[in-house]
């Protein structure tokens, strides 16, 4: 009888993570007597996957009925494959012996490659907000994919970005891989509603890429523009001064009125109006009783936006331009929720 040969017909097998891998092996003879074993890897560090002789291998099932001596099919199935199972598997025939069984003949090996989907990309932006015209960095990470080949693209509002750097780790062979990319984005005042998208394409995704998004509303700070104006006289001794706070984001804003440098009133932006671009406008009124002042008044609208240093705009109120009623220091009627009388 010809000497036993161990035949592994498949040089390689490709399996999706979570599925079952079938590793084929047949022997050409019933002799010598002794067990078949499966190993991952070769050499002294090889890992035992299945032993016909003994042991408990819950993930492994034999394809054929090994309780029949005439059966020479030693193929196995390994269930619930993960990227960690990738490697070269050897079907090895042993000859019964002591003190140990003796390796008699090995198959040529079957390389098991595992296709694993990348995790959903996670996009993160800078820790602190930035203002328009500044360049900010966004990172995108995805993990656990195999094989290594992967494509990553960045978009801002559907327009592909070109200023980014991508790394896939590790560089060498591995059971699975991770991708890390950093994109640079220049902010504009119109970016409150903008989105940055990281798109990952991989062979396991069948043409349906995974996307991770970041809203620039989390990143941008649009500082307000201020305009202080004097409204027409409402009564002979009253002037209405307004501070228009325009095009700011986020909403967190505190406004202080100063009269000749002295704090008159502080309020927080509440009932704001939203612009189409996502920024906010707000207006504060100040009702000034000019009859209470002998000299010109310098009114200052001071705004602290989103914890940033205050910006201000002033308006000089010419008292001499208004006739005064002697002894009149009566409070004028307060007609607006943001109005305040100054005496």
């Amino acid at each position: 009888e010809e000497e036993l040969q161990v035949i592994q017909p498949d040089k390689s097998v490709l399996v999706a993570a979570g599925e079952t891998a079938t590793l084929r092996c047949t022997a050409t003879s019933l002799i010598p007597v002794g067990p078949i074993q499966w190993f991952r890897g070769a050499g002294p560090g090889r890992e035992l996957i299945y032993n016909q002789k003994e042991g408990h291998f819950p993930r492994v099932t034999t394809v054929s009925d090994l309780t029949k001596r005439e059966n020479m099919d030693f193929s196995i199935r390994i269930g619930n494959i993960t990227p960690a199972d990738a490697g070269t598997y050897y079907c090895v025939k042993f000859r019964k012996g002591s003190p140990d069984d003796v390796e008699f003949k090995s198959g040529a090996g079957t390389e098991l490659s595992v296709r694993a989907k990348p995790s959903a990309p996670v996009v993160s932006g800078p820790a602190a907000r930035a203002t328009p015209q500044h360049t900010v960095s966004f990172t995108c990470e995805s993990h656990g994919f195999s094989p290594r080949d992967i494509t990553l693209k960045w978009f801002k509002n559907g327009n592909e970005l070109s200023d980014f750097q991508t790394n896939v780790d590790p560089v060498g062979e591995s059971v699975s891989y991770s991708i890390h990319s950093t994109a640079k984005v220049v902010l504009t005042r119109e970016d409150v509603h903008s989105q940055v998208i990281c798109e990952v394409a991989h062979v396991t995704l069948q043409g349906d890429p995974l996307r991770g998004t970041a809203n620039l509303s989390e990143t941008i700070r649009v500082p307000p523009t201020l305009e202080v104006t004097q409204q027409p006289v409402r009564a002979e001794n009253q002037v209405n001064v307004t501070c228009q706070v325009r095009k700011f984001y986020p909403q967190r804003l505190q406004l202080t009125w100063l009269e000749n440098g002295n704090v008159s009133r502080t309020e927080t932006a509440s009932t704001v109006t939203e612009n189409k671009d996502g920024t906010y406008n707000w207006m504060s009124w100040l009702l000034v009783n000019v009859s209470a002042h002998r000299d010109d008044v310098k009114l200052t609208c001071q705004v602290e936006h989103d914890g940033q240093p205050a910006v201000s705009k002033s308006h000089d109120l010419k008292v001499s331009a208004h006739p005064k009623e002697q002894g009149s220091n009566t409070a004028a009627e307060n007609t607006g929720s943001n109005e305040r009388n100054i005496y």
């Epitope: 029949k68 001596r69 002591s98």
Partner: antibody
């Protein structure tokens, strides 16, 4: 059902011959290593002979040159030709099947009695 | 040839007892050791192979252990049908050899 049935035992004079048969059913005999084991009355078990799937044969020292193990695949049968029998060969002879991969005995026949006496 | 030595040669025990029979090989036999049960006038029955694996249909009260030269057969809770003679056997190399047997009797 997997079964082994021995036959051919009996009374024989010293120096005589006897041929034991073992009919296998429920499996293909040629795919297994097959054995003969004997047991003298009131004594322990003694392995006698074996034949491998490739036709290779093995014997215990006391029967070498006198006993011959063989098989006939067409009849799915195992044989033990015993020549130059001695009184010490008196025993029940069992036909035994070797295990699937390690040749561990798994199936035994009921045995046939061989008596060598004048 | 490899010699197989069983101890004890005979053993008296009661129903419900746990008993252990030992078998020693004269040289390393890996774990190619089998245990058989034989009742008077009957053919032996295969219980255990490769020192610890139970043959199909053998109750789990039988267990085997050991490797190299020293082996044991344990019966966890004796029942009346377990009183018999037990043999160990090495089958790592020809000639296969048996122990002399251990007769398990009712006390």
């Amino acid at each position: 059902e997997v079964q082994l049935v021995e036959s051919g035992g009996g009374l024989v004079q010293p120096g005589g011959s006897l041929r034991l048969s073992c009919a296998a059913s429920g499996f293909t005999l040629s795919s297994y290593d097959m054995h003969w084991v004997r047991q003298a009355t009131g004594k322990g078990l003694e392995w006698v002979s074996a034949i491998g799937t490739a036709g290779d044969t093995y014997y215990t020292g006391s029967v070498k040159g006198r006993f011959t193990i063989s098989r006939e695949n067409a009849k799915n049968s195992l044989y033990l030709q015993m020549n130059s029998l001695r009184a010490g060969d008196t025993a029940v002879y069992y036909c035994v099947r070797g295990g699937v991969w390690d040749d561990a005995f798994d199936i035994w026949g009921q045995g046939t009695m061989v008596t060598v006496s004048s | 040839d490899i010699q197989m030595t069983q101890s004890p040669s005979s053993l008296s025990a009661s129903v419900g007892d746990r008993v252990t029979i030992t078998c020693r090989a004269s040289q390393d036999i890996n774990n190619y050791l089998a245990w058989f049960q034989q009742k008077p006038g009957k053919a032996p029955k295969s219980l255990i192979y490769t020192a610890s694996s139970l043959h199909s249909g053998v109750p789990s009260k039988f267990s085997g252990s050991g490797s190299g030269t020293d082996f044991t057969l344990t019966i966890s809770s004796l029942q009346p049908e377990d009183f018999a003679t037990y043999y160990c056997q090495q089958y790592v190399s020809y000639p296969y050899t048996f122990g002399q047997g251990t007769k398990l009797e009712i006390k």
